[in-house]
């Protein structure tokens, strides 16, 4: 009983339940392959509980092991389009601080029009995650087709 | 020690660890694009701890943010079959109550024979999730090829 | 306050937060379709907290329901290569003890060069998971392209 009460009284953030699910806002300007994300209940089913957005990129607020997941669907796409524009590649990585820059997850579209994957990775407070889409095909902004999220799993 | 005892004494459900993993039972009748699911240890490695099945559709019992995941493999399929029968699309959404109806996750098969993805989404007690497979190709019922599940992540 | 203190004093392992993320070490010798994995901070972003490696295969240390995820990318691959070498298939399963041997997750590459999926499954202490890659194409050892992991979710 005491535990149940304590659990209710403690703010969720103190339990380390950081979580975010983002939807695509827009693609990058000149020579910037990054996707820019947005989140919040006013936009639909996206949210940030703990992590924050910094100019459309996701910044981590709590050290720990995270499950990172992403799905990106190309906007005008058939298997012939996808192969004609090959290579179209998506990479998720830590882009800042520069000292921790690393690619975490990489996928090519080949003859498909959607990529989806997930992985466990250690992240530290202040790490900013970037999602780079290289190639000439553009992503769909539908919230059920393109999304990006993280879930804190353990310290 | 006190915490460990308390944790053991509390039913898991009170910690909010709702989770389900389902296997395909059958496809819908004429004009019903929904897949019908089943779960339980007697069937293999599927289970429901918290959520329930309502006529083959998954109903949520606890408010919270959930990780929803799915994999569907087409039964008699090669890349040529898949492209010839295109478009074959899978959509996961809230189908009831009607006031909350929305598509959460959508994928097309294009030249592939399997789709797999996952996402974080808020769900409320009473939400029923439906998985609609549109097209003429049929899903495999092998439990390692086609499955659908949810995991409660946080309030 | 008491709960927060107790939580900090208890070793994480007692909370059941077993988790592992592995990177590819090498493929098996002749007639052995298994992939051999490695993990540890010295190797990059892979780690084992609870589960262990037994001759490159992942052994579970705690009973429970786990989220199992995998991504495998073929090393020298285009959609034409993938279709020419078809079928290339990846299967994740319990390979020992023999009495519990079962396939948990199966995917074919068809015309793609990457597969990625995840599922919830009950696992028991002592279960060893094997990942079998059948076909003539070889997997990439890049840590952002090929990885395999498990996360304890609940008892």
């Amino acid at each position: 009983q005491r535990f149940a009460q304590a659990q209710q009284q403690l703010p969720l953030e103190s339990l380390g339940w950081d979580v975010a699910e983002l939807q695509l806002n827009h693609t990058g300007p000149q020579q910037d392959p990054r996707l820019y994300w947005q989140g919040g209940p006013a936009l639909g089913r996206s949210f940030l509980h703990g992590p924050e957005l910094d100019k459309g990129q996701l910044r981590i607020h709590r050290d720990g092991i995270y499950m990172v997941h992403i799905q990106v669907t190309l906007a005008i796409c058939s298997s012939t389009t996808a192969s004609r524009h090959h290579p179209t590649t998506l990479a998720v990585g830590i882009c800042s601080p520069a000292s921790r820059s690393i690619s975490l997850l990489r996928l090519s579209f080949h003859q498909g029009c959607t990529i989806a994957s997930q992985r466990l990775t250690p992240l530290a407070r202040g790490d900013t995650l970037c999602t780079n889409l290289t190639g000439t095909l553009l992503p769909s902004r539908n919230t059920d087709e393109t999304f990006f999220g993280v879930q804190w799993v353990r310290p | 020690q006190r915490f460990a005892q308390a944790q053991q004494q509390l039913p898991l459900e009170s910690l909010g660890w709702d989770v389900a993993e389902l296997q395909l039972n059958h496809t819908g009748p004429q004009q019903d694009p929904r897949l019908y699911w089943q779960g339980g240890p007697a069937l293999g490695r599927s289970f429901l701890h918290g959520p329930e099945l309502d006529k083959g559709q998954l109903r949520i019992h606890r408010d919270g943010i959930y990780m929803v995941h799915i994999q569907v493999t087409l039964a008699i399929c090669s890349s040529t079959t898949a492209s010839r029968h295109h478009p074959t699309t899978l959509a996961v959404g809230i189908c009831s109550p009607a006031s909350r109806s929305i598509s959460l996750l959508r994928l097309s098969f294009h030249q592939g024979c399997t789709i797999a993805s996952q996402r974080l989404t808020p769900l409320a007690r009473g939400d029923t999730l439906c998985t609609n497979l549109t097209g003429t190709l049929l899903p495999s019922r092998n439990t390692d090829e086609t499955f659908f599940g949810v995991q409660w992540v946080r309030p | 306050q008491r709960f927060a203190q107790a939580q900090q004093q208890l070793p994480l392992e007692s909370l059941g937060w077993d988790v592992a993320e592995l990177q590819l070490n090498h493929t098996g010798p002749q007639q052995d379709p298994r992939l051999y994995w490695q993990g540890g901070p010295a190797l990059g972003r892979s780690f084992l907290h609870g589960p262990e490696l037994d001759k490159g295969q992942l052994r579970i240390h705690r009973d429970g329901i786990y989220m199992v995820h995998i991504q495998v990318t073929l090393a020298i691959c285009s959609s034409t290569t993938a279709s020419r070498h078809h079928p290339t298939t990846l299967a994740v399963g319990i390979c020992s003890p023999a009495s519990r041997s079962i396939s948990l997750l199966r995917l074919s590459f068809h015309q793609g060069c990457t597969i990625a999926s995840q599922r919830l499954t009950p696992l028991a202490r002592g279960d060893t998971l094997c990942t079998n890659l059948t076909g003539t194409l070889l997997p990439s050892r890049n840590t952002d392209e090929t990885f395999f992991g498990v996360q304890w979710v609940r008892p």
Partner: nanobody, 129 residues
């Protein structure tokens, strides 16, 4: 509905220059990207250059450093400046627009996007001495 009008094609000597224009009229606020494709005789249509609504550009390897795509938002026009032209650049050049239309659907007011490609009628570029 969007309409596209192309101009600027013609005959030019190797090493010469041309500037193609493509003017869009209609619902120009929903343009996601504009591009130029080329189709040489007996070959499939291939992307030459693309510019997104965010200003990002992409070029085919064969034209990098020679062709420049630009966009004048005030005139709703996309340009392709073609320099150092080669005989192998001879082709019909098509203007392409990726159109993103938005609708609010369903009981929760879900915003949905529909994507559509619109093509111009093509303009012939011949590079020959």
């Amino acid at each position: 509905q969007l309409q596209l009008v192309e101009s600027g094609g013609g005959l030019v000597q190797p090493g010469g220059s041309l500037r193609l224009s493509c003017a869009a009229s209609g619902n120009i606020f929903s343009i996601y990207a504009m591009a130029w494709y080329q189709q040489a005789p007996g070959k499939q249509r291939e992307l030459v250059a693309q510019i997104t609504n965010a200003g990002s550009t992409n070029y085919a390897d064969s034209v990098k450093g020679r062709f420049t795509i630009s966009r004048d938002n005030a005139k709703n026009t996309v340009y392709l400046q073609m320099n150092s032209l080669k005989p192998e650049d001879t082709a019909v050049y098509y203007c392409n627009v990726l159109h993103e239309s938005t609708e609010v659907a369903g009981p929760v007011g879900e915003k949905r996007y529909t994507y559509q490609e619109i093509w111009g009628q093509g303009t012939l570029v011949t590079v020959s001495s």
